[in-house]
Amino acid sequence: MMTGTIETTGNISAEKGGSIILQCHLSSTTAQVTQVNWEQQDQLLAICNADLGWHISPSFKDRVAPGPGLGLTLQSLTVNDTGEYFCIYHTYPDGTYTGRIFLEVLESSVAEHGARFQIP
């Protein structure tokens, strides 16, 4: 039975041209995390594998940095970066856990971080 929950940075906003850290945390399970995939809608951004380390998709190499931890840093943000981001935790023996983050990239300096929330 899957007992874990994923806590994410939730709904967040950031300024155009700035950077943001996408973070997820898996808790309430002893399952081993073998890999974390980061996706934006239907595009692979990056993968962190327990054995192989990080792989950043070539088309995002200039604007995506691995970490901190299993998180992902997006740099040089544009309005087109607004949207849903998913952290997909592959674990053994539990299986797959998915967390969702919504990022809004704003033109002005009114960006604020949203509250943290949990996805079971």
Epitope: L44, D51, H90
Partner: antibody, heavy 118, light 107 residues
Framework: EVQLLESGGGLVQPGGSLRLSCAAS????????MHWVRQAPGKGLEWVAS????????YYADSVKGRFTISRDNSKNTLYLQMNSLRAEDTAVYYC???????????WGQGTLVTVSS | DIQMTQSPSSLSASVGDRVTITCRAS??????LNWYQQKPGKAPKLLIY???SLQSGVPSRFSGSGSGTDFTLTISSLQPEDFATYYC?????????FGGGTKVEIK
């Protein structure tokens, strides 16, 4: 240089058994998931089986489930496919393949031909 | 199981032509789609992974696009060495499945 070298193919009668091996070199074998993919003469590619890097999980195509067993020996950098109760439709070139991040096949062996015929 | 449907099954083209091959999944596979090239008597070779990422060492005339259920492999200017069979493959879920292949022949 990454190398995958299959062996063990040959002619076998229906109902017989074969064990394929794939010797890996040029990379840290124990860090990668490995797959077997086959191709019948003149046909397309068919995934057969896969095994995680730490041997914790194995997966099989329905067409071979219960007859084929995938395994690996990380200390010997070798992947295996034990094939039992072979059928004529198992006739194919069998490729071993390296799969980083459980996502794409970036290296293939040269293949070994298995012919099941009486 | 996820079915992968490739079209066309074969095509004839000339050197310098722009060639497009499509692959459709029977359900959404996000960007878990890879493209391979195979020449007669040889093992397949990875061209594109994760729908649009060019594998290291593959010429830039190859490109991939799409997400969800519909994907495209494009060869911007066909070269003599590109005449081969091309396969798509989904790695979204087990069993992994391949398209039926597209044979690119010389016109």
């Amino acid at each position: 240089e990454v190398q995958l070298l299959e062996s063990g193919g040959g002619l076998v009668q229906p109902g017989g058994s074969l064990r394929l091996s794939c010797a890996a070199s040029g990379f840290t074998f124990s860090s990668y998931s490995m797959h077997w993919v086959r191709q019948a003469p003149g046909k397309g590619l068919e995934w057969v089986a896969s095994i995680k890097s730490d041997t914790s999980s194995t997966y099989y195509a329905d067409s071979v489930k219960g007859r084929f067993t995938i395994s690996r020996d990380n200390s010997k950098n070798t992947l295996y496919l034990q094939m039992n109760s072979l059928r004529a439709e198992d006739t194919a070139v069998y490729y071993c393949a390296r799969v980083p991040y459980d996502y794409w096949i970036d290296y293939w062996g040269q293949g070994t031909l298995v012919t099941v015929s009486s | 199981d996820i079915q992968m449907t490739q079209s066309p099954s074969s095509l004839s083209a000339s050197v310098g032509d722009r060639v497009t091959i499509t692959c459709r999944a029977s359900q959404s596979i996000s960007s878990y789609l890879n493209w391979y090239q195979q020449k007669p008597g040889k093992a397949p070779k990875l061209l594109i992974y994760a729908a649009s990422s060019l594998q290291s060492g593959v010429p830039s005339r190859f490109s991939g696009s799409g997400s969800g259920t519909d994907f495209t492999l494009t060869i911007s200017s066909l070269q003599p060495e590109d005449f081969a069979t091309y396969y798509c493959q989904q790695s979204y879920s087990t069993p992994l499945t391949f398209g039926g292949g597209t044979k690119v022949e010389i016109k």
